[in-house]
Amino acid sequence: MAVTACQGLGFVVSLIGIAGIIAATCMDQWSTQDLYNNPVTAVFNYQGLWRSCVRESSGFTECRGYFTLLGLPAMLQAVRALMIVGIVLGAIGLLVSIFALKCIRIGSMEDSAKANMTLTSGIMFIVSGLCAIAGVSVFANMLVTNFWMSTANMYTGMGGMVQTVQTRYTFGAALFVGWVAGGLTLIGGVMMCIACRGLAPEETNYKAVSYHASGHSVAYKPGGFKASTGFGSNTKNKKIYDGGARTEDEVQSYPSKHDYV
């Protein structure tokens, strides 16, 4: 029972995490214009992995895709790659874990096969989560570096009174979604790996041993005991738990407008 719960919960947590990673990857708000200590602009800029957007005070929003591959910074390409690898691994992990779920019976699949699949999906979730966390962290580091660079030359004097304002970018909502989602996927993966230990039966057959007592010749033959580890559920009398957990997809909602401080 505990194994089923751990495995099911691991699956659900990973599912939510991967949905979050997909949402974060698609979101436009990876970096948003820094409004603090800045002249108040009637135009708000924000950028994602795939396009950059401008929302005017009028409410008009214009987004432009990055239609070049070679012209983009290597770091951005690396972040894209990490997020995509995370999504792909997570998706494969989900597919594998569905068949590995203890509450789902597929033909005459052995517990050992389910244990292996659970471990495989768990490792995939862990790597997926790490990819997402790494991707988001690389992007965040890039933002911090650029932020302080642009702060250093925030105002570049041009012929006395004329000044050029450099737009500074700070952390967008997608970064937080990505960090949380990556963490959830990672936790889900760890839970799957823990569940795997409870699923895997350690076949330890004790050989028949003869004990010779003085006066009587009696042979004690203990039957082949199965030593179960950890969460040890009786492998002979399995219970099937139907109706896996339902999850609600994360709804990504964008604010209708930005406040200009």
Epitope: A42, V43, Q47, S57, S58, Y260
Partner: antibody
């Protein structure tokens, strides 16, 4: 077609308050911010502030923060600007104007001539 | 606040002449996000409200004659009337649409001989 209708003139006494109106028609009122602009006789244009009719979020020019209060009535598609503690300096033509993409004012009312006199 | 400086304050020309007027802002009006300049030109004829001519520094509003052309970027902008007509008698204002509060230039008065 888009129209912004304003009363032609208002005459008020110094120290009093006045509420100027701007009735919008020909478009979805809540989709566009409404701006107010002041023009003193023979002078240039001064932006007072704007309001988002969908949620009444406002931006003010600090110069007019204590002078003007912007409101809207969605049911009648009308924007209002209340001016308080009026002095002769407030005598001017007040325009309402719709904010469109490019943050430009694409449609203007005919203006209300406010005269502050005792 | 952003200061918009227009020059000349007035100019007198004959019909058919080419006219240019300048507008300078105290800070750049170029938005890095979409590479657009948030500067607008308005025309105000006597006794009328201002009329939108050009937005995003160079985009002509629909219905505006093509003799009106906006140019410039960053802090320096120009409005050009290729062939002045008698009906162009008006005051022309430039406006900062990038920073709050929105600010207008003092205007350039165009007079016809």
């Amino acid at each position: 077609q888009v129209q912004l209708q304003q009363p032609g003139a208002e005459l008020v006494k110094p120290g009093a308050s006045v509420k100027l109106s701007c009735k919008a028609s020909g478009y979805t009122f809540t989709r566009y911010r409404m701006n107010w602009v002041k023009q003193r006789p023979g002078q240039g244009l001064e932006w007072i502030g704007n309001i988002d009719p969908s949620d009444s979020e406002t931006h003010y020019n600090q110069k007019f923060k204590d002078k003007a209060t912007l409101t809207v009535d969605k049911s009648s598609s009308t924007a209002y600007m209340q001016l308080s503690s009026l002095t002769s300096e407030d005598s001017a033509v007040f325009y309402c104007a719709r904010l469109n993409y490019g943050n430009c004012f694409d449609y203007w009312g005919q203006g209300t001539t406010l005269t502050v006199s005792s | 606040d952003i200061v918009m400086t227009q020059s000349p304050s007035s100019l007198t020309v004959t019909a058919g002449e080419k006219v240019t007027m300048s507008c300078k802002s105290s800070q750049t009006l170029l938005n890095s996000g979409n590479q657009k300049n948030y500067l607008t030109w308005y025309q105000q004829k006597p006794g009328q409200p201002p009329k939108l001519l050009i937005y995003w520094a160079s985009t002509r509003e629909s219905g505006v004659p093509d003799r009106f052309t906006g140019s410039g970027s960053g802090t320096d902008f120009t409005l050009t009337i290729s062939s002045v007509q008698a009906e162009d008698l008006a005051v022309f204002y430039c406006q900062n649409d990038y920073f709050y509060p929105f600010t207008f230039g003092s205007g350039t008065k165009l007079e016809i001989k």
